[in-house]
Amino acid sequence: MKVLQEPTCVSDYMSISTCEWKMNGPTNCSTELRLLYQLVFLLSEAHTCIPENNGGAGCVCHLLMDDVVSADNYTLDLWAGQQLLWKGSFKPSEHVKPRAPGNLTVHTNVSDTLLLTWSNPYPPDNYLYNHLTYAVNIWSENDPADFRIYNVTYLEPSLRIAASTLKSGISYRARVRAWAQCYNTTWSEWSPSTKWHNSYREPFEQH
């Protein structure tokens, strides 16, 4: 039994880091493998993660962490029984994938303005809480070409757009994702999408 692709890990910078790797053949990850992880920290203790299968030869492990700070560094040991298959380390602050925003809501009752709001996925005491920026994706269910991205570079989790920038009388969907420049993170997953029917009063045209 050998590791074909070494574990790579990403952290949500709160409580979970996810490590994925591939073995050289079909493996029952949960029964054959264990990933031990330990904070490099005086008198810390090792923890065991039981991996799950992620495709035939792929494994994934969700490492539970009690908060994350920038100095954190973990040692990782992948075991198959008594055999050490791989040894490495992981610094969560250098491999951050933020949590996805939630509770995306489209408010359509503000004159002819669409107000989109969502929730910051972090509690106020987490470092990322004040460092997230967002991308909002809006698209038409009827027209695949009607697809747009709005970059929200301010901290407030909201976006206002004129309803008239979208077509009237058709349905749209929106979703939002987050990233943090401070840690050069990857983008989060997209939030679940929300749907609304776009309608607004056409301005009276004079000829």
């Epitope: 810390s44 203790e45 920038s70 100095a71």
Partner: antibody, heavy 120, light 108 residues
Framework: EVQLLESGGGLVQPGGSLRLSCAAS????????MHWVRQAPGKGLEYVSG????????YYANSVKGRFTISRDNPKNTLFLQMSSLRAEDTAVYYC?????????????WGQGTTVTVSS | EIVLTQSPGTLSLSPGERATLSCRAS???????LAWYQQKPGQAPRLLIY???RRATGIPDRFSGSGSGTDFTLTISRLEPEDFAVYYC?????????FGQGTKLEIK
């Protein structure tokens, strides 16, 4: 309420021994690394020793290595510091301290301290 | 072994003023953790800041920590009468624990 209560301090002659105890209440001792920190009269804080939650690893400051032994009895929620070959410079208030992993070495709960005096 | 040096040794200020306390490490400690404590006469120390900049539970927001590498700072934005005490920085690393010698913050 989370509390640490030290006992066992007193007056001892140079070369003598003493055993300090620390009774924990309000939390499960085995979930935390525990430490001893001391403070000589009119001086600053000095780290003495620590032990992991499962007793698998211990650590000692160079000044006490080979003379002091830290241990714990998790079922009884008690931490110990066995001190031998005591010297005048070991005279201090000894604090029992809890380290919460979330606090990354920040010592969030301190006992009130027990005084050890080494003198002839 | 890493040495932490605090400055100044004594800081004399008045209530309402801003206090800036320094803690310098003898080598880079970016892979370790820095904490700050307050100690009043006859009392055990109290944890104020951990992980360089995070306030411990119940600590007022006038206390803040910052720094990286070898230079760290504890700032008290507006001194209250109860803030006059001795302050210690502490390093907790992979292989050792060290305290600074302390800064006494006294009323001017």
């Amino acid at each position: 309420e989370v509390q640490l209560l030290e006992s066992g301090g007193g007056l001892v002659q140079p070369g003598g021994s003493l055993r300090l105890s620390c009774a924990a209440s309000g939390f499960t001792l085995s979930s935390y690394a525990m430490h001893w920190v001391r403070q000589a009269p009119g001086k600053g804080l000095e780290y003495v020793s620590g032990i992991s939650g499962n007793s698998a690893s211990t650590y000692y400051a160079n000044s006490v290595k080979g003379r002091f032994t830290i241990s714990r009895d998790n079922p009884k929620n008690t931490l110990f510091l066995q001190m031998s070959s005591l010297r005048a410079e070991d005279t201090a208030v000894y604090y029992c301290v809890r380290v919460k992993l979330k606090y990354r070495g920040g010592m969030d709960v301190w006992g009130q301290g027990t005084t050890v005096t080494v003198s002839s | 072994e890493i040495v932490l040096t605090q400055s100044p040794g004594t800081l004399s200020l008045s209530p309402g003023e801003r206090a800036t306390l320094s803690c310098r490490a003898s080598q880079d400690i970016s892979s370790a953790y820095l904490a700050w404590y307050q100690q009043k006469p006859g009392q055990a120390p109290r944890l104020l800041i951990y992980g360089t900049s995070r306030r411990a539970t119940g600590i007022p927001d006038r206390f803040s920590g910052s720094g990286s590498g070898t230079d760290f700072t504890l700032t008290i934005s507006r001194l209250e009468p109860e803030d006059f005490a001795v302050y210690y920085c502490q390093l907790y690393g992979a292989t050792s624990v060290t305290f600074g010698q302390g800064t006494k913050l006294e009323i001017k």
